[in-house]
């Protein structure tokens, strides 16, 4: 039975040209995290494997930095980066947990962070 929940940074906004940290946290389970995949729609951004470490997708190498922790830092943001991002936690023995973050990249200098929310 899957008892865990993923807490994410929720809906966030950031300025064009700036950077943002995408962060998820898995709680309420004793399952072992074996791998975390970061995806945008159906595109892979990066993977953090518990043993093999980080793998950054070639097309994002210049703009994605691993961490902090299991999170991901997006740099040199463009308006095209607006959209949904998913953290996919592979765990044993539970299986897969998915968290969703919506990022809006703003032209203006007014970019406020949204509230944290939970996905069961």
């Amino acid at each position: 039975m899957m008892t865990g929940t993923i807490e994410t940074t929720g809906n966030i906004s950031a300025e064009k040209g700036g950077s943002i940290i995408l962060q998820c946290h898995l709680s309420s389970t004793t399952a072992q995290v074996t791998q975390v995949n970061w995806e945008q729609q159906d595109q892979l951004l990066a993977i953090c494997n518990a043993d093999l470490g980080w793998h950054i997708s070639p097309s994002f190498k210049d703009r994605v930095a691993p961490g902090p922790g299991l999170g991901l830092t997006l740099q040199s943001l463009t308006v095209n980066d607006t959209g949904e991002y998913f953290c996919i936690y592979h765990t044993y023995p539970d299986g897969t947990y998915t968290g969703r973050i919506f990022l809006e990249v703003l032209e203006s200098s007014v970019a406020e962070h949204g509230a944290r929310f939970q996905i069961p």
């Epitope: 993977i47 494997n49 070639p58 299986g95």
Partner: antibody, heavy 119, light 108 residues
Framework: QVQLVQSGAEVKKPGASVKVSCKVS????????MHWVRQAPGKGLEWMGG????????IYAQKFQGRVTMTEDTSTDTAYMELSSLRSEDTAVYYC????????????WGRGTLVTVSS | DIQMTQSPSSLSASVGDRVTITCRAS???????LAWYQQKPGKAPKLLLY???RLESGVPSRFSGSGSGTDYTLTISSLQPEDFATYYC?????????FGGGTKVEIK
Amino acid sequence: QVQLVQSGAEVKKPGASVKVSCKVSGYTFTEYTMHWVRQAPGKGLEWMGGINPNNGGTIYAQKFQGRVTMTEDTSTDTAYMELSSLRSEDTAVYYCARLVLRYWYFDVWGRGTLVTVSS
Amino acid sequence: DIQMTQSPSSLSASVGDRVTITCRASASSNVIYLAWYQQKPGKAPKLLLYDTSRLESGVPSRFSGSGSGTDYTLTISSLQPEDFATYYCQQWSSNPLTFGGGTKVEIK
């Protein structure tokens, strides 16, 4: 096209070590993790472990822990697998295989290297 | 470790037959990723399907996969002469990655 070229067949005595190489071409070596799978004569496939050429991170099957060492040389785009304390049961074809980490499957395989352990 | 039990271990079939091979995981743990390979004597395995049902580029559409949780199936809708080979499933949900024992498809 993408190719994994493995070193030639080896005959070893029990207790010895063997080091098998796998040279890649047709893609950027650091963009995939490289794994090793063996197959004893007439038997099934057995995963041994893998290495991330990006950072040298390794993952080994517990069965081989302490006996296997996987390394890479990014200057020559080559992965290596060394197995020590060889015994007759280690007689097998050893394959290197490129792993797609997103879905954990092997999309490209080497042709295999036969290692025979015999006194 | 999650053991993958493949059945049958061998089967005899004729060209044009529909063939189904199953793979069952030993643990109640969810298998996260499941792939299928074809191997011919003296050759390296060849990828057919990954992520349970995604067909590898260049693989004929007569091959299909399905399943979830602990039970998975490879189906060949109409067996062709070049399909006589041994088939392996492979799972990953944690270390170690494991393969099924194989299913040898022979000519009846």
